[in-house]
């Protein structure tokens, strides 16, 4: 059987706000008074398990004690209250929870949605944390009419049990009730029509057009509550690879609509789109986005030729030479699609034109020493682009006019080429540059430049400490100008190695040192001086300083009968790197002289 | 300045023969193709016979194969045409022309144009 407790605390079920002062009392029944042979000044208060101190305790009088808390801040108590029966022994009379919290705030932004096809939600903020059990109830009638209340599982959002009616407006509020308190939102009026979120479009499909490579044509299926509504859309687009998305204006998408044509597009170019939908007044929400769908703008023909220029071999025979005509394939913003062949003309004065189909990006053809002019077209399934046109003069010709004030630089890890045009008007400037060996040959690249460039930076993959031979040529509408040549790297570092020194003459005083240049292959950069460093096994270093351009160097004041150790570094703008060390020892006496 | 200049044309009977000749000037003639082209009464040029430089290559248009003959002396710069078995279709303005490059290449389109005064051949009866 449960044994009857021997007093007990009142409140039962206490719940203070945090911050204030709360009084609890401990009421001893009188039965246990006398068989404890106690009263209250027995009676000792404990919080979780820890005594309360003295001068929080009221003896009220002899079955009453009072314990006050000032300033509770923590959210859960354990209160008890307990006896010392016959003086010693520690006895429990009674014990609760004391809970401590906020009375509930008004809820505010009170915001409800109805998602296509489903019931209405509504969400709010409920304010500051009470810590304490707080039931929140989503409230909603008509003028004439309550709905079931909805009881919130979360404390910040309810979804009705109910279809809503739309065309009828609603008000709803929401009731927050805890220990402590009770409040109510401010209450909203709304229809439930302009709180729509339609489901997103669906079998969104695009389709081009062979008249005009620059559209998309979109089609799309709506739902708008089965036709209920009548939606606006919002249409974006992007490029296959492009990570942000491109907006259609709204203004041209306001009017319900289930098909719309993107204009100003690229040909030939792959779209991602996506759409999303809202009723036409603006009011609701935005569904979500479509699934994308793809779709590519049909060909063009190529908006520009390609870049074109030629190279002679040396002609075997004295009547023909073996010219190279060479171009570059267009980058796909100026094919405008798929480049199925090429056209180059050779035409002559009151000759006979001659046409060749070429799906490869040169051509090599036997011409006379006779001028000739040489022009391409890149073809695609649209049509052919503008031609380009290259005078290939007669190899008697002198080329006049070159570039003046030619440099190259490395910059932002590009190597950088600018010259000062030649005094006549330019058609086209062409780059070309190879890496310098002597180990393999020249391999060139090259590059177009149009006439109103006079800076620009070489577009191909260029290594490090690597010298390039770097090329330009002004072509005019007679033909090719003159060539001017510089070297140039894009990241220079110490030499792979330093110089060999040999002793070319060597005299009781002197001694004439050389040395070869370092090999292109191994200079990673210009050479911009040697250091000599030498000594004897007992002397201190000596070291001098040599211009690049020197290959030797006399060693003045030495002593005669000396072994002398030498050494020699190469130096370009990113350090040095020493050669072997060698040695020499300077003779006795003079040629001639003796003892 | 690239000169041509073509004679040996006039009125022959159907079965008849005719030879035509191409003077050349103002270019290295022996390092160039030639062609012969004709143009008949309300129609377009139409390519005949080509040669390469060195006369060892010869192509004839299928309308007059086995019976024209193509050949040059490029020691006197002119070029011939030897027209055997005429037919009245045959009636037309003959040029000749010279091409851009030494090999005539059957593969390769070509834009041919009549820059001479042209030579008539009228074959009736």
């Known amino acids: 059987q449960l044994l009857e407790p021997c007093g007990y605390i009142y409140p039962e079920f206490p719940v203070v706000q945090r911050g204030s002062n709360f009084t609890a009392i401990c009421v001893l029944k009188e039965a246990c008074l006398q068989h404890y042979y106690v009263n209250a000044s027995y009676i000792v208060w404990k919080t979780n398990h820890a005594a309360v101190p003295r001068e929080q305790v009221t003896v009220i009088n002899r079955t009453t004690s009072s314990v006050t808390f000032t300033d509770v801040v923590l959210p859960s108590v354990q209160l008890t209250c307990n006896i010392l029966s016959f003086g010693q022994i520690e006895q429990n009379v009674y014990g609760v929870t004391m809970l401590s919290g906020f009375p509930p705030d008004k809820p505010t932004n009170l915001t409800c949605i109805v998602n296509e096809g489903k019931n209405m939600l509504c969400q709010w903020d409920p304010g500051r944390e009470t810590y304490l059990e707080t039931n929140y109830t989503l409230k909603s009638e008509w003028a004439t009419e309550k709905f079931p209340d909805c009881q919130s599982k979360h404390g910040t959002s309810c979804m009705v049990s109910y279809m809503p009616t739309y065309y009828v407006n609603i008000e709803v509020w929401v009731e927050a009730e805890n220990a402590l308190g009770k409040v109510s939102s401010e209450s909203i009026n709304f229809d439930p029509v302009d709180k729509v979120k339609p489901t997103p479009p669906y079998n969104l499909s695009v389709t081009n057009s062979e008249e005009l490579s620059s559209i998309l044509k979109l089609s799309w299926v709506s739902s708008g509550l089965g036709g209920l509504l009548d939606l606006k859309s919002d249409i974006q687009y992007r490029t296959k690879d492009a990570s942000t998305w491109i907006q259609v204006p709204l203004e041209d998408t306001m009017s319900p609509r289930t098909s719309f044509t993107v204009q100003d597009l690229k040909p030939f170019t792959e779209y991602v789109f996506r759409i999303r939908s809202i009723k036409d007044s603006g009011k609701g929400y935005w569904s979500d986005w479509s699934e994308e769908a793809s779709g590519t703008t049909y060909e063009d023909r190529p908006s520009r030729p390609p870049s074109f220029w030629y190279k002679t071999n040396p002609s075997h025979g004295q009547e023909y030479r073996s010219v190279r005509l060479i171009w570059k394939a267009l980058p796909l913003s100026e094919a405008n699609g798929k480049i199925l062949d090429y056209e180059v003309i050779l035409t002559q004065s009151k000759s006979v034109s001659q046409t060749y189909t070429v799906t490869g990006t040169e051509l090599t053809v036997n011409l006379t020493n006779d001028r000739y002019v040489a022009s391409l077209a890149a073809r695609n399934k649209v049509g052919k682009s503008a031609a380009a046109v290259l005078t290939i003069p007669s190899p008697h010709v002198t080329a006049a006019y070159s570039v003046v004030n030619l440099k190259a630089f490395p910059k932002d890890n590009l190597l950088w080429v600018e010259w000062t045009p030649p005094p006549k008007p330019v058609s086209k400037y062409i780059l070309e540059w190879c890496v310098l060996s002597e180990n393999a040959p020249c391999v060139e690249d090259w590059q177009q430049e149009d006439a109103t460039v006079n800076r620009t930076h070489l577009r191909g993959r260029l290594l490090e400490s690597k010298c390039y031979q770097i090329t330009v040529t002004p072509v005019f509408a007679t033909g090719p100008g003159g060539s001017e040549s510089l070297k140039a790297y894009l990241k220079q570092a110490a030499p792979a190695r330093g110089p060999t020194v040999r002793t070319k003459k060597v005299g009781k005083n002197e001694a004439v040192l050389a040395w070869d240049q370092i090999p292109v292959d191994d200079q990673n950069g210009f050479i911009r001086n040697y250091s000599i460093s030498y000594r004897t096994s007992v002397g201190k270093e000596m070291v001098v300083h040599v211009d690049s351009s020197h290959t030797e160097y006399t060693l003045s004041s030495l002593s005669s009968d000396t072994l002398y150790m030498v050494r020699m570094a190469a130096y370009t703008d990113e350090g040095g790197k020493d050669g072997p060390e060698f040695t020499f020892t300077t003779p006795k006496f003079a040629q001639g002289e003796i003892e | 300045q690239v000169q041509l200049q073509e004679s040996g044309g006039g009125l022959v009977q159907p079965g008849g023969s005719l030879r035509l000749s191409c003077a050349a000037s103002?270019?290295?003639?022996?390092?160039?193709?030639m062609s012969w082209v004709r143009q008949a009464p309300g129609k377009g040029l139409e390519w005949v016979s080509a040669?390469?430089?060195?006369?060892?290559?010869?192509y004839y248009a299928d309308s007059v194969k086995g019976r024209f003959t193509i050949s040059r002396d490029n020691a006197k710069n002119t070029l011939y045409l030897q027209l055997n078995s005429l037919k009245t279709e045959d009636t037309a303005m003959y040029c000749c022309?010279?091409?851009?490059?030494?090999?005539?290449?059957?593969?390769?389109?070509?834009?041919?144009?009549?820059w001479g005064p042209g030579t008539q051949v009228t074959v009736s009866s």
């Open positions: 103002g270019f290295t003639f022996s390092s160039y193709a």
């Open positions: 022309a010279k091409h851009v490059t030494g090999d005539y290449d059957p593969s390769l389109r070509y834009e041919y144009n009549c």
């Open positions: 040669i390469n430089s060195g006369g060892a290559s010869t």
